[in-house]
């Protein structure tokens, strides 16, 4: 079948999800496409525990996640509710800063060097993290 029962080569399994950590940079939309071509999505952080796991693997490097407000409200790429979900913004962020001189504000979220989140210009070539969930069907215990 099409069930994903284990993580692909070079991906890291954690809490029934698979994660892939880039070592090169792309703009947010290009990173999003990269993940999609892997049948995955940019990482969606749903807990402090997941935050610490991702932070441990990326180190102190700006890294895209699957959170943006390019169409108005902040949205996670997999549909996870933003308002009620986990957040870890830096103080006074997101600020949609226009002072960078690159045109427009800041519509894409990334992990900063201390792991907390910031909104930034989506065209910046940051590293990124892809995530894909192991299928629920594969979580069923085997029949004895």
């Amino acid at each position: 079948g099409s069930e994903r029962t284990c993580c692909p080569v070079n991906w890291v399994e954690h809490e029934r999800s698979c994660y892939w950590f880039s070592r090169s940079g792309k703009a947010w939309a290009d990173a999003d496409n990269y993940c999609r071509l892997e049948d995955a999505h940019l990482v969606v952080v749903t807990s402090w525990e997941e935050q610490k796991f991702v932070q441990h693997h990326i180190g102190p490097v700006n890294t895209w996640m699957g959170l943006h407000d390019q169409n108005g409200p902040w949205k996670w790429v997999d549909g996870t509710d933003y308002e009620t979900g986990f957040k870890n913004w830096r103080p006074e962020q997101p600020d949609d800063w226009y002072g960078h001189g690159l045109g427009g504000g800041e519509d894409c979220a990334h992990f900063t060097d201390d792991g907390r989140w910031n909104d930034d210009v989506c065209q910046r070539p940051y590293r990124w993290v892809c995530e894909t969930e192991l299928d629920k069907a594969s979580q069923e215990p085997p029949l004895l």
Epitope: S2, D30, Y34, R36, E38, D39, P125
Partner: antibody, heavy 118, light 107 residues
Amino acid sequence: EVQLLESGGGLVQPGGSLRLSCAASGFTFSSYAMSWVRQAPGKGLEWVSSISGRGGSTFYADSVKGRFTVSRDNSKNTLYLQMNSLRAEDTAVYYCAKSNSSGWFDYWGQGTLVTVSS
Amino acid sequence: DIQMTQSPSSVSASVGDRVTITCRASQGITDWLAWYQQKPGKAPKLLIYAASSLQSGVPSRFSGSGSGTDFTLTFSSLQPDDFATYYCQQTNSFPWTFGQGTKVEIK
């Protein structure tokens, strides 16, 4: 040994349709993105379309968007390209290629010629 | 779309020559670049990926370098089997795009 074998090319009138197939062997087909790349006679290479390993995501060049559809049947290790509303400028050799999300094409088929002419 | 421009469009060289061909991207693509070799009537063959990584089985006389917008493919000592057309390809952004090709001919 990785092998990719295209079929389905031929002569078709403008406005017509054609479906190309690419039979794959020698690797775990469902684990890799696949792509179509074309080359008009005497011209350079043009990326046409890509599809993720499990078929959940597809990507197209603007020149074929809305006319071509890429799909795959992992149970048959086969990649497809359904081409509708064909135009003279679609005349080319069509290659299927094993790729990945990084976009490098490490294995190619031998190509199949599509000629669109009245 | 990102435009890829190769130069020269053709080059005449002799066996044993050191030859360099270049590829320029219309915007920065970090190291998301590949090089292919194509011979008449045949499918392209991957030589270099990630700007400078040699594909398995490709002779070490081929090397790639560059990042950002400017890239080069170098033949340290041209061999008879190397006379072909070479294409660069960017995979930084969709649509993935190729250069127009550089034909390496026998002098």
